[in-house]
Every structure is written in structure tokens, then in C-alpha cells.
């Protein structure tokens, strides 16, 4: 349904508050270095313009596309070339190339200062003095650091952020009330950002078909009672929503997401019995709740898959008539029966099935050729099962920090060319799979673990893509979306790597380490561990563990010393010399 003015249509659908918030997110995700005040000014100008279009859809420029309007506005920024360099060249292009150009310049790792949390009293004062600016600043700071954050979900986070301050700034112990809530929002926000980043990578690097396959598998697990046609409709709509958000079309995305939530709630009976509570909530909470809803119970007495997909004489006929529909049905049927499998495993099985049909339907006796296709699934299922079992045992034996360290060593030896901060960040996140998933019973471990690992390995892939340094990482990241994790798992020590030259500065520590939080201190130690492996890739696990224990003893000693800085300087030299002597650094 065409509208005379797209901007007026979205303003009316979303309301002024959401319109302004979403435009701010869009602008901050494109121009990540611009000051807050500049973005607020641009957003206010766009909003005033939108209001004129609501009043008269035939007014000048109201018929322009949102990309044209927003792009023109972004291109008015005076400091575009000096701040963003070649991104300024985007402004010489016409739509849709201009928007594509802006999208290509989104930076997953922008050079922005770490967000430091002020004192609680300072935050509460700022919140009370100007609530609107305080909340806008939150949207701005998150959006510019996470340029693919799912915009309608960021509105939900902002609503929770506001609620936390509203409640806690009146509490007797403000800090005890507020800080745990902010920690939770921060951790959930990072996880949400990473999950959305994988969706966008899936769409942008592997195409709509890959995303749709993922969505069919996931929604079939979640809604196993829904008919295939219903799941297909949801997949089509969900794909549109995520395509829009990943493409910077945040107003359309938020609007369509609201429509999808409305549709799901109006059709609960044919979708899932688990949606009742979600559908009683207000819009933002409702959409979030639906996205996180638990899997419905599987229908009783589902027939064997073999009948339709192996034993039937019509397999090749059905496949030839509509390949993607037939494969989609296979994926739907398999996924709804297997909530215990990861989505990526289900996609591997579907790919194996597709490859077998491609080969066998051209053979002399197709049925004879594909009769044993399900036997090919067994090793594909067992591989992640065994890997998860081994790693959960290791996690339970070591605890999270030391499990992370084991992964740090493992991944640094696999891809030593990758930057140390990236290896630390990714390995720490890989290590969190233990606490997140190993507590679950067998039936929930694989979907938890392997789908989480897909999200984390995508972080590695997008960070590496910005500055490619390893052919092995590029290969694992680009060859197959669903085989990324097995590809990285299969990597052995990189024997071609020339050890990094020793640099004493890398191993120089100062008294500031004593005042760091436990998490920050761990990151310092893990950074040293990665550097150690890069210098000495042949060091044994035992040697590395022993050197790290020396490091811990050194830090503990100097943090207890009266003259800490002198201790770090003198004892640090001794530690480096001792490690050099022992490892031949």
C-alpha cells in the first residue's frame, strides 16, 4: 500500500517518541564519531520536517524516500570528510548506492572511548535534571558502538533503562538497587548486539536464502505445532523485518516488527500455546517476549520422517517441482522433531540431504542411491555432541577463567596472526559457553552451546574482516555459514607462523593493575598469555600455566608492597628475565 509521503506514514504509525528515537539510532549507527549534540540537532530537523508532511503529505520533498531524506541530512554534516575520510565520498552518489555506501562504512570496532559508569548520585542527578536527554544519550552511546544493534529492541532496552533509574533513584540504597540492573542490561545488551550481528552477517554475506533457512529451522523448533504454511509466512515476515533493520531502514523495520507481533498474537492458536503471557504485554515487551519464548511442546505421534523423505517414490518428483519448498518442508519436519539439535546442525543435515538429492535424482536408480541418506547424518550429529561433552567436562574441571585461558591458548595457536585484543575478547566469550550451557540437561546443551558459538565466531569474523590478517580465518568465515564452528574446531596449530619478536614493553606492568576490577585484571593476565603464546607457540600447556602462575605471584607480591611502582619495575624485569631463561623467549 503506497503512501504519498513515506516519512508521514512512519511518523503516524510509530508516534513521535519512537520516530525520534529510531532516527537518532539510525544516524548514530551511520555517523559513529559525531557528537551527541550534532545528532540531536539533525533528529530535531528531521522530526520537524516529518510533522510538516503529516500536516500536508503533498508538501515539498514529502514524497521523497526515507533514504533520500536521511542521506541528504547526513550529508549536511560539515566535518564529514575530516572525521570520516572516504565515507564523505558516499555523498556524491545517488540513492540507492549512497545508502549502500554508508552501510559499507559501518564500523564494528569504532575507535571510541570505553563507556565509564559515573557515580550513582551523578547519574541520578543527570536523570532527574533532564530525563529526555539522559535517555537519548543512552540510545546514542549504544547505537554508535553497536552499529547493527536491532533498533526496535534497543527501544525496549531504553525503556528498561528508564525504569531502572525511575525506581532506583528513589531507593534508600540507590547503588544496591541500580548497579545490578545496569550490569544486567549491559550483559544482555552485548548478547543482543552479537546475536543481531549474526543475523545481519547471514543476510549480507550469505543472502536471503541462508537467513530464511535459519529462520525455518529456529521457528519450527519453537512452534512445532504450527503448520508448514504458517511457519513459512512467519519466516517471510521475519526476513523482511531483519532485512530492513540490517539495511538501515529502522522505521520500516520497527513498524513491520510491530505488525508481526500483532499477527502472531492474533493467531496464537495456530502458532503456539506458549504465547499467551507475551501477548498480554505492551508492544516493546511483547515483541521481546515473543522473540525469546520457550519452545512449544512437540505434537504427539509425529510420523517418521523417512516415509516422506526417503521411502516415498515421489521424492525426486517433489524435489524437482519446487526444490526450496521441498527442502524447507524437510527442514521444518526435522527441526520440529529436534529441539535438542542446534539450528546450525539442522542446517548441515538439510544441506547433506540437498546434496544427496542433487546427486541421486540424476542417477539411474535414485531411490537406491538416496535410501541410506539418513545414515550420513549420524557423524554430523555425533561431532557436536562429543565436542560439547568434552568441553563441558573441561569447563567443570577448570572453572570459567581457566577454561577461557585454555581456549585462549587453543585459538592463539590456531590463528596467531589475529590481534591480541580480538583473541582475548573472542576467547573470553567462547569460554562463557560453559557457564551458559553446561548447566543444562543433555537435551538443551547442543542448541544452547553451538548456536551461541556461532554468534561468538561471527564476532571474530566481522572483526577480522575489517583488518584481514589470516587466510585461515577468512576461509572459515566465508566458505560456509553453518560450518564455521566445525571449520575453526578442525584447525590445528599454525605451523607456518613465525613467532613474534620479543618486546619487553608488552610484559611491563604497573601499579594500576592493583586497583582494577577482577574482570579487568583477568583481561590483563589473558592479554599477557596471548602475547606469550605468540612469542612461544611451541610452549607446552604446562609451561604456559606455570609462567602464568609466576605472573600471578608477581602481581600479588607487588600489590602488597609498600612501594608498588618500584616493585612492578624491579620484579617485572626479573619475571621477564626468568621467563626468557626458562622458555628461551
Amino acid at each position: 500500500d503506497a503512501h504519498k509521503s513515506e516519512v508521514a506514514h512512519r511518523f503516524k504509525d510509530l508516534g513521535e517518541e519512537n520516530f525520534k528515537a529510531l532516527v537518532l539510532i539510525a544516524f548514530a549507527q551511520y555517523l559513529q564519531q559525531c557528537p551527541f549534540e550534532d545528532h540531536v540537532k539533525l533528529v530535531n530537523e528531521v522530526t520537524e520536517f516529518a510533522k510538516t508532511c503529516v500536516a500536508d503529505e503533498s508538501a515539498e520533498n514529502c514524497d521523497k524516500s526515507l533514504h533520500t531524506l536521511f542521506g541528504d541530512k547526513l550529508c549536511t554534516v560539515a566535518t564529514l570528510r575530516e572525521t570520516y575520510g572516504e565515507m564523505a565520498d558516499c555523498c556524491a552518489k545517488q540513492e540507492p548506492e549512497r545508502n549502500e555506501c554508508f552501510l559499507q562504512h559501518k564500523d564494528d570496532n569504532p575507535n571510541l572511548p570505553r563507556l565509564v559508569r559515573p557515580e550513582v548520585d551523578v547519574m541520578c542527578t543527570a536523570f532527574h535534571d533532564n530525563e529526555e536527554t539522559f535517555l537519548k544519550k543512552y540510545l546514542y552511546e549504544i547505537a554508535r558502538r553497536h552499529p547493527y544493534f536491532y533498533a526496535p529492541e534497543l527501544l525496549f532496552f531504553a525503556k528498561r533503562y528508564k525504569a531502572a533509574f525511575t525506581e532506583c533513584c528513589q531507593a534508600a540504597d540507590k547503588a544496591a538497587c541500580l548497579l545490578p540492573k545496569l550490569d544486567e542490561l549491559r550483559d544482555e545488551g552485548k548478547a543482543s548486539s552479537a546475536k543481531q550481528r549474526l543475523k545481519c552477517a547471514s543476510l549480507q554475506k550469505f543472502g536471503e536464502r541462508a537467513f530464511k533457512a535459519w529462520a525455518v529451522a529456529r521457528l519450527s523448533q519453537r512452534f512445532p505445532k504450527a503448520e508448514f504454511a504458517e511457519v513459512s509466512k512467519l519466516v517471510t515476515d521475519l526476513t523482511k523485518v531483519h532485512t530492513e533493520c540490517c539495511h538501515g531502514d529502522l522505521l520500516e523495520c520497527a513498524d513491520d516488527r510491530a505488525d508481526l507481533a500483532k499477527y502472531i498474537c492474533e493467531n496464537q492458536d495456530s502458532i503456539s500455546s506458549k504465547l499467551k503471557e507475551c501477548c498480554e504485554k505492551p508492544l516493546l515487551e511483547k515483541s521481546h517476549c515473543i522473540a525469546e519464548v520457550e519452545n512449544d511442546e512437540m505434537p504427539a505421534d509425529l510420523p517418521s520422517l523417512a516415509a516422506d523423505f526417503v521411502e516415498s517414490k515421489d521424492v525426486c518428483k517433489n524435489y524437482a517441482e519446487a526444490k526450496d519448498v521441498f527442502l524447507g518442508m524437510f527442514l521444518y519436519e526435522y527441526a520440529r522433531r529436534h529441539p535438542d539439535y542446534s539450528v546450525v546442525l539442522l542446517l548441515r543435515l538439510a544441506k547433506t540431504y540437498e546434496t544427496t538429492l542433487e546427486k541421486c535424482c540424476a542417477a539411474a536408480d535414485p531411490h537406491e542411491c538416496y535410501a541410506k541418506v539418513f545414515d550420513e547424518f549420524k557423524p554430523l550429529v555425533e561431532e557436536p555432541q562429543n565436542l560439547i561433552k568434552q568441553n563441558c567436562e573441561l569447563f567443570e574441571q577448570l572453572g570459567e577463567y581457566k577454561f577461557q585461558n585454555a581456549l585462549l591458548v587453543r585459538y592463539t595457536k590456531k590463528v596467531p596472526q589475529v590481534s591480541t585484543p580480538t583473541l582475548v575478547e573472542v576467547s573470553r566469550n567462547l569460554g562463557k559457553v560453559g557457564s551458559k550451557c553446561c548447566k543444562h540437561p543433555e537435551a538443551k546443551r547442543m542448541p544452547c552451546a553451538e548456536d551461541y558459538l556461532s554468534v561468538v565466531l561471527n564476532q571474530l569474523c566481522v572483526l577480522h574482516e575489517k583488518t584481514p590478517v589470516s587466510d585461515r580465518v577468512t576461509k572459515c568465515c566465508t566458505e560456509s555459514l553453518v560450518n564455521r564452528r566445525p571449520c575453526f574446531s578442525a584447525l590445528e596449530v599454525d605451523e607456518t607462523y613465525v613467532p613474534k619478536e620479543f618486546n619487553a614493553e608488552t610484559f611491563t606492568f604497573h601499579a594500576d593493575i592493583c586497583t582494577l576490577s577482577e574482570k579487568e585484571r583477568q583481561i590483563k593476565k589473558q592479554t599477557a598469555l596471548v602475547e606469550l603464546v605468540k612469542h612461544k607457540p611451541k610452549a607446552t600447556k604446562e609451561q604456559l600455566k606455570a609462567v602464568m602462575d609466576d605472573f600471578a605471584a608477581f602481581v600479588e607480591k607487588c600489590c602488597k608492597a609498600d612501594d608498588k611502582e618500584t616493585c612492578f619495575a624491579e620484579e617485572g624485569k626479573k619475571l621477564v628475565a626468568a621467563s626468557q631463561a626458562a622458555l628461551g623467549l
Partner: nanobody, 124 residues
């Protein structure tokens, strides 16, 4: 199972020297730091020295710094504590211990395996 056996203790005059030895068997000796601790009657067990896995880095308690020297011979699975200029306040049972997988390097709780101890008595 790890076994640690100390030897070399005895009764000496103030100002004299003693050399304690600790022979280890069990898990790979060279993978772990070793510690020397002591316990005087009616007192807590206290840290004396830590000798790292390769013998290239040693940390001491302030009370023994400059008088005691820790060393190890990984080929012989043995760790040593050379004690010079002994004082009456050094009187205690001396224990050698093998580092555990976690905890403080300067606290008994950070060490997993212990010897039975050897008595050192310094008379004035």
C-alpha cells in the same frame, strides 16, 4: 599421588646455617612452583619462600629476605632452602609444598600437596 619428603632440619646455634631438602615424586615436578612454609608452636603456618617451576624466580617473606635462598633441581625432583644467619625466631617446623591450581601463592590454601615437615631449632 604426590609425595614430598623434607630432610636437613636440626638443632643449630644462632648465626649458623642449614640446608633443607625436599624430594618429590608423583606428578611432573617441573610443571609446578614449590613453596616453603613454617609453623612455630602456637602460631599459624606462614609463607617463607616460593621457587618457580624453572627455578629462575624466587620470592621470599620479608623476615627471611637476604638470609634464605630457595633453589631447585628439576632433574632430581628436589627443592632446597639454604638458611644462613639463623635466628632463634626462625625456630619452627618447616614444610615444603607443591603449588595447586588456584589460590594465593603466599597462602597455604594455594598449595595442594605437603610434606610431613622437618624441625629446625635455633638456640641462642
Amino acid at each position: 599421588q604426590v609425595q614430598l619428603v623434607e630432610s636437613g632440619g636440626g638443632l643449630v646455634q644462632a648465626g649458623d646455617s642449614l640446608r633443607l631438602s625436599c624430594a618429590a615424586s608423583g606428578r611432573t615436578f617441573s610443571d609446578y612452583a614449590m613453596g616453603w612454609f613454617r609453623q612455630a608452636p602456637g602460631k599459624e603456618r606462614e609463607f617463607v619462600a616460593r621457587i618457580n617451576w624453572s627455578g629462575t624466580l624466587t620470592y621470599y617473606a620479608d623476615s627471611v629476605k637476604g638470609r634464605f635462598t630457595g633453589s631447585r633441581d628439576n632433574a632430581k625432583n628436589t627443592v632446597y632452602l639454604q638458611m644462613n644467619s639463623l635466628k632463634p625466631e626462625d625456630t619452627a617446623v618447616y614444610y615444603c609444598a607443591q603449588r595447586g591450581d588456584s589460590g594465593s601463592n603466599y597462602d597455604p590454601s594455594g598449595y595442594s600437596y605437603w610434606g610431613q615437615g622437618t624441625q629446625v631449632t635455633v638456640s641462642s
